[in-house]
Interface confidence: low
Protein backbone atom coordinates (compact mmCIF):
# COMPACT_ATOMS: atom_id res chain seq x y z
CA UNK A 1 0.00 0.00 0.00
CA UNK A 2 1.28 3.49 -0.75
CA UNK A 3 2.46 5.59 2.15
CA UNK A 4 -0.23 7.89 3.53
CA UNK A 5 0.50 11.59 3.46
CA UNK A 6 -1.25 14.82 4.33
CA UNK A 7 -0.48 18.35 3.24
CA UNK A 8 0.07 20.88 5.99
CA UNK A 9 1.82 24.03 7.02
CA UNK A 10 3.63 24.48 10.32
CA UNK A 11 3.93 27.51 12.56
CA UNK A 12 6.04 27.81 15.66
CA UNK A 13 4.48 28.69 18.99
CA UNK A 14 5.17 32.38 18.31
CA UNK A 15 3.10 32.05 15.11
CA UNK A 16 6.11 32.38 12.82
CA UNK A 17 5.65 30.69 9.45
CA UNK A 18 8.25 28.67 7.59
CA UNK A 19 9.45 29.83 4.17
CA UNK A 20 12.17 28.83 1.73
CA UNK A 21 15.41 30.77 2.02
CA UNK A 22 17.50 29.76 -0.94
CA UNK A 23 17.26 26.30 -2.44
CA UNK A 24 18.17 24.25 0.64
CA UNK A 25 17.20 26.26 3.71
CA UNK A 26 14.05 27.14 5.63
CA UNK A 27 13.65 30.23 7.77
CA UNK A 28 10.95 31.30 10.22
CA UNK A 29 9.27 34.69 10.20
CA UNK A 30 5.93 36.36 10.81
CA UNK A 31 3.84 36.57 7.65
CA UNK A 32 0.60 38.47 7.05
CA UNK A 33 -1.94 38.82 4.29
CA UNK A 34 -0.83 37.77 0.83
CA UNK A 35 2.66 37.01 2.12
CA UNK A 36 1.16 33.91 3.75
CA UNK A 37 1.29 32.34 0.29
CA UNK A 38 5.07 32.18 0.67
CA UNK A 39 4.88 29.65 3.49
CA UNK A 40 6.11 26.16 2.77
CA UNK A 41 3.51 23.42 2.36
CA UNK A 42 4.78 20.12 3.70
CA UNK A 43 3.76 16.68 2.59
CA UNK A 44 3.81 14.84 5.90
CA UNK A 45 4.12 11.10 5.34
CA UNK A 46 3.30 8.52 8.00
CA UNK A 47 6.25 6.17 7.89
CA UNK A 48 7.64 3.08 9.58
CA UNK A 49 9.20 3.54 12.99
CA UNK A 50 8.63 3.25 16.71
CA UNK A 51 5.10 4.40 17.47
CA UNK A 52 3.07 5.09 20.59
CA UNK A 53 -0.12 6.98 21.40
CA UNK A 54 1.66 10.31 21.57
CA UNK A 55 4.57 9.66 19.20
CA UNK A 56 4.09 9.11 15.48
CA UNK A 57 6.98 8.68 13.00
CA UNK A 58 6.70 11.00 10.01
CA UNK A 59 8.78 12.32 7.13
CA UNK A 60 8.52 15.96 6.12
CA UNK A 61 8.77 16.55 2.41
CA UNK A 62 8.14 19.81 0.63
CA UNK A 63 4.96 19.46 -1.38
CA UNK A 64 5.60 18.89 -5.09
CA UNK A 65 9.35 19.19 -4.59
CA UNK A 66 11.81 16.34 -4.28
CA UNK A 67 13.16 17.76 -1.02
CA UNK A 68 12.90 16.26 2.47
CA UNK A 69 14.04 17.49 5.83
CA UNK A 70 16.83 15.23 7.05
CA UNK A 71 19.16 15.07 10.03
CA UNK A 72 22.88 14.44 9.52
CA UNK A 73 26.12 14.99 11.39
CA UNK A 74 28.07 18.01 10.22
CA UNK A 75 31.29 18.79 12.06
CA UNK A 76 30.17 16.26 14.69
CA UNK A 77 26.93 18.14 15.35
CA UNK A 78 23.40 16.93 14.48
CA UNK A 79 22.21 19.26 11.73
CA UNK A 80 18.94 19.82 9.89
CA UNK A 81 19.12 20.04 6.13
CA UNK A 82 16.92 19.88 3.06
CA UNK A 83 17.96 16.86 1.05
CA UNK A 84 17.15 16.20 -2.57
CA UNK A 85 15.78 12.73 -3.38
CA UNK A 86 14.73 10.77 -6.44
CA UNK A 87 10.97 11.46 -6.77
CA UNK A 88 10.46 8.01 -8.31
CA UNK A 89 11.41 6.40 -4.99
CA UNK A 90 9.97 8.81 -2.43
CA UNK A 91 7.94 9.00 -0.30
CA UNK A 92 8.07 5.40 0.89
CA UNK A 93 6.87 3.60 3.99
CA UNK A 94 10.37 2.63 5.10
CA UNK A 95 12.23 5.92 4.98
CA UNK A 96 15.90 6.10 5.90
CA UNK A 97 16.27 7.09 9.54
CA UNK A 98 17.75 10.51 8.78
CA UNK A 99 14.41 11.49 7.22
CA UNK A 100 12.27 10.32 10.14
CA UNK A 101 10.94 12.57 12.88
CA UNK A 102 8.92 11.53 15.89
CA UNK A 103 5.88 13.79 15.84
CA UNK A 104 5.02 14.28 19.51
CA UNK A 105 1.86 15.98 20.68
CA UNK A 106 1.83 17.75 24.04
CA UNK A 107 -1.06 20.06 24.98
CA UNK A 108 -2.14 20.49 21.36
CA UNK A 109 1.37 21.58 20.37
CA UNK A 110 3.66 19.45 18.23
CA UNK A 111 7.32 18.66 18.61
CA UNK A 112 9.41 17.00 15.92
CA UNK A 113 12.19 14.91 17.41
CA UNK A 114 14.87 13.50 15.14
CA UNK A 115 14.68 9.70 15.06
CA UNK A 116 18.37 9.63 14.14
CA UNK A 117 19.35 11.91 17.03
CA UNK A 118 17.03 11.46 20.03
CA UNK A 119 16.39 14.62 22.07
CA UNK A 120 17.24 16.84 19.10
CA UNK A 121 14.25 18.78 17.78
CA UNK A 122 13.27 20.90 14.81
CA UNK A 123 13.70 24.38 16.24
CA UNK A 124 13.32 28.06 15.45
CA UNK A 125 14.95 31.11 16.99
CA UNK A 126 13.15 33.81 18.93
CA UNK A 127 14.56 36.24 16.39
CA UNK A 128 12.81 36.92 13.10
CA UNK A 129 14.02 35.63 9.74
CA UNK A 130 16.48 33.07 11.10
CA UNK A 131 17.08 29.53 9.78
CA UNK A 132 15.08 26.57 11.01
CA UNK A 133 17.58 24.24 12.68
CA UNK A 134 18.02 21.11 14.77
CA UNK A 135 18.32 22.03 18.44
CA UNK A 136 19.41 19.93 21.38
CA UNK A 137 17.50 21.79 24.09
CA UNK A 138 13.83 22.08 24.98
CA UNK A 139 12.31 24.78 27.13
CA UNK A 140 15.14 27.24 26.58
CA UNK A 141 15.35 30.29 24.37
CA UNK A 142 14.81 28.37 21.17
CA UNK A 143 11.33 27.29 20.08
CA UNK A 144 10.52 23.60 19.61
CA UNK A 145 6.69 23.76 19.70
CA UNK A 146 4.63 23.97 16.52
CA UNK A 147 1.04 23.92 15.37
CA UNK A 148 -0.06 22.18 12.21
CA UNK A 149 -2.50 23.65 9.70
CA UNK A 150 -4.22 21.15 7.42
CA UNK A 151 -4.11 22.01 3.71
CA UNK A 152 -6.50 20.30 1.30
CA UNK A 153 -4.69 18.53 -1.50
Amino acid sequence: APVRSLNCTLRDSQQKSLVMSGPYELKALHLQGQDMEQQVVFSMSFVQGEESNDKIPVALGLKEKNLYLSCVLKDDKPTLQLESVDPKNYPKKKMEKRFVFNKIEINNKLEFESAQFPNWYISTSQAENMPVFLGGTKGGQDITDFTMQFVSS
Epitope: R4, F46, N53, I56, K103, E105, L110
Partner: nanobody, 122 residues
Framework: EVQLLESGGGLVQPGGSLRLSCAAS????????MMWVRQAPGKGLEWVSR????????YYADSVKGRFTISRDNSKNTLYLQMNSLRAEDTAVYYC???????????????WGQGTLVTVSS
Protein backbone atom coordinates in the same frame (compact mmCIF):
# COMPACT_ATOMS: atom_id res chain seq x y z
CA GLU B 1 -10.38 4.36 -3.50
CA VAL B 2 -11.63 5.95 -0.28
CA GLN B 3 -13.72 9.06 -0.92
CA LEU B 4 -15.44 11.39 1.51
CA LEU B 5 -17.61 14.20 0.17
CA GLU B 6 -18.96 16.83 2.56
CA SER B 7 -21.90 19.13 1.85
CA GLY B 8 -24.33 21.40 3.68
CA GLY B 9 -22.07 24.30 4.59
CA GLY B 10 -23.00 27.91 4.03
CA LEU B 11 -23.60 31.28 5.61
CA VAL B 12 -25.81 31.34 8.70
CA GLN B 13 -26.63 33.93 11.34
CA PRO B 14 -25.53 33.51 14.96
CA GLY B 15 -28.01 31.27 16.76
CA GLY B 16 -28.91 29.52 13.51
CA SER B 17 -28.61 25.89 12.47
CA LEU B 18 -27.01 23.85 9.70
CA ARG B 19 -26.83 20.16 8.92
CA LEU B 20 -23.67 18.84 7.32
CA SER B 21 -23.56 15.56 5.41
CA CYS B 22 -20.65 13.40 4.34
CA ALA B 23 -21.12 10.74 1.67
CA ALA B 24 -18.57 7.93 2.00
CA SER B 25 -17.43 5.39 -0.56
CA UNK B 26 -14.53 3.04 -1.26
CA UNK B 27 -14.57 1.28 2.13
CA UNK B 28 -17.00 -0.59 4.37
CA UNK B 29 -18.49 2.45 6.08
CA UNK B 30 -20.27 0.51 8.84
CA UNK B 31 -16.99 -0.97 10.07
CA UNK B 32 -15.37 2.36 10.93
CA UNK B 33 -15.70 5.00 13.59
CA MET B 34 -16.15 8.35 11.81
CA MET B 35 -15.47 11.89 12.91
CA TRP B 36 -15.72 15.57 12.13
CA VAL B 37 -12.79 17.94 12.44
CA ARG B 38 -12.67 21.62 11.61
CA GLN B 39 -10.15 24.32 10.78
CA ALA B 40 -10.93 27.95 11.50
CA PRO B 41 -9.23 30.57 9.30
CA GLY B 42 -5.55 30.75 10.19
CA LYS B 43 -5.86 28.14 12.95
CA GLY B 44 -4.89 24.51 13.38
CA LEU B 45 -7.13 21.48 13.15
CA GLU B 46 -9.68 21.05 15.91
CA TRP B 47 -11.44 17.77 16.63
CA VAL B 48 -15.22 18.28 16.80
CA SER B 49 -16.96 14.94 17.25
CA ARG B 50 -16.78 11.23 16.58
CA UNK B 51 -19.26 8.38 16.38
CA UNK B 52 -18.87 4.62 16.75
CA UNK B 53 -19.61 2.08 14.05
CA UNK B 54 -23.17 1.39 15.16
CA UNK B 55 -23.95 5.03 15.96
CA UNK B 56 -24.44 4.46 19.68
CA UNK B 57 -21.20 5.87 21.07
CA UNK B 58 -20.74 9.58 20.40
CA TYR B 59 -18.13 12.00 21.68
CA TYR B 60 -17.89 15.79 21.45
CA ALA B 61 -15.34 18.52 22.00
CA ASP B 62 -16.25 20.72 24.96
CA SER B 63 -16.65 23.70 22.63
CA VAL B 64 -19.62 22.10 20.81
CA LYS B 65 -21.15 19.87 23.49
CA GLY B 66 -24.92 20.40 23.80
CA ARG B 67 -25.10 22.26 20.48
CA PHE B 68 -23.87 19.75 17.90
CA THR B 69 -25.15 16.24 17.24
CA ILE B 70 -23.28 13.66 15.20
CA SER B 71 -25.16 10.78 13.59
CA ARG B 72 -24.81 8.28 10.77
CA ASP B 73 -26.91 6.20 8.40
CA ASN B 74 -24.97 3.06 7.57
CA SER B 75 -27.52 2.03 4.95
CA LYS B 76 -26.72 5.24 3.04
CA ASN B 77 -22.98 5.34 3.88
CA THR B 78 -23.53 8.86 5.18
CA LEU B 79 -22.28 10.79 8.21
CA TYR B 80 -24.12 13.85 9.55
CA LEU B 81 -23.43 16.78 11.84
CA GLN B 82 -26.42 18.76 13.09
CA MET B 83 -25.18 22.15 14.29
CA ASN B 84 -27.51 24.29 16.41
CA SER B 85 -27.03 27.58 18.28
CA LEU B 86 -24.16 28.44 15.97
CA ARG B 87 -21.64 31.05 17.09
CA ALA B 88 -19.12 33.18 15.22
CA GLU B 89 -16.33 31.02 16.61
CA ASP B 90 -17.82 27.99 14.81
CA THR B 91 -16.79 29.55 11.49
CA ALA B 92 -14.45 27.02 9.88
CA VAL B 93 -13.99 24.50 7.12
CA TYR B 94 -15.51 21.24 8.37
CA TYR B 95 -14.00 17.94 7.28
CA CYS B 96 -15.34 14.47 7.79
CA UNK B 97 -12.73 11.81 8.39
CA UNK B 98 -12.28 8.10 8.81
CA UNK B 99 -11.02 7.47 12.33
CA UNK B 100 -7.84 5.48 13.00
CA UNK B 101 -8.33 4.99 16.73
CA UNK B 102 -5.41 7.07 17.95
CA UNK B 103 -6.41 9.41 20.72
CA UNK B 104 -4.29 12.45 20.01
CA UNK B 105 -5.62 15.35 18.00
CA UNK B 106 -3.34 15.24 14.98
CA UNK B 107 -3.25 11.46 14.68
CA UNK B 108 -6.95 10.78 14.55
CA UNK B 109 -7.67 10.10 10.92
CA UNK B 110 -6.20 8.52 7.84
CA UNK B 111 -8.65 9.73 5.18
CA TRP B 112 -10.60 12.98 5.01
CA GLY B 113 -12.73 14.91 2.54
CA GLN B 114 -12.29 18.25 0.81
CA GLY B 115 -14.30 20.08 3.45
CA THR B 116 -17.33 22.35 3.52
CA LEU B 117 -17.16 25.96 4.69
CA VAL B 118 -19.45 27.12 7.50
CA THR B 119 -19.59 30.89 8.05
CA VAL B 120 -21.47 32.23 11.06
CA SER B 121 -22.01 35.96 10.70
CA SER B 122 -24.75 38.53 11.01
Amino acid sequence: EVQLLESGGGLVQPGGSLRLSCAASGFTFAEYTMMWVRQAPGKGLEWVSRIGQDGKNTYYADSVKGRFTISRDNSKNTLYLQMNSLRAEDTAVYYCAKYTGRIFTHHLFDYWGQGTLVTVSS
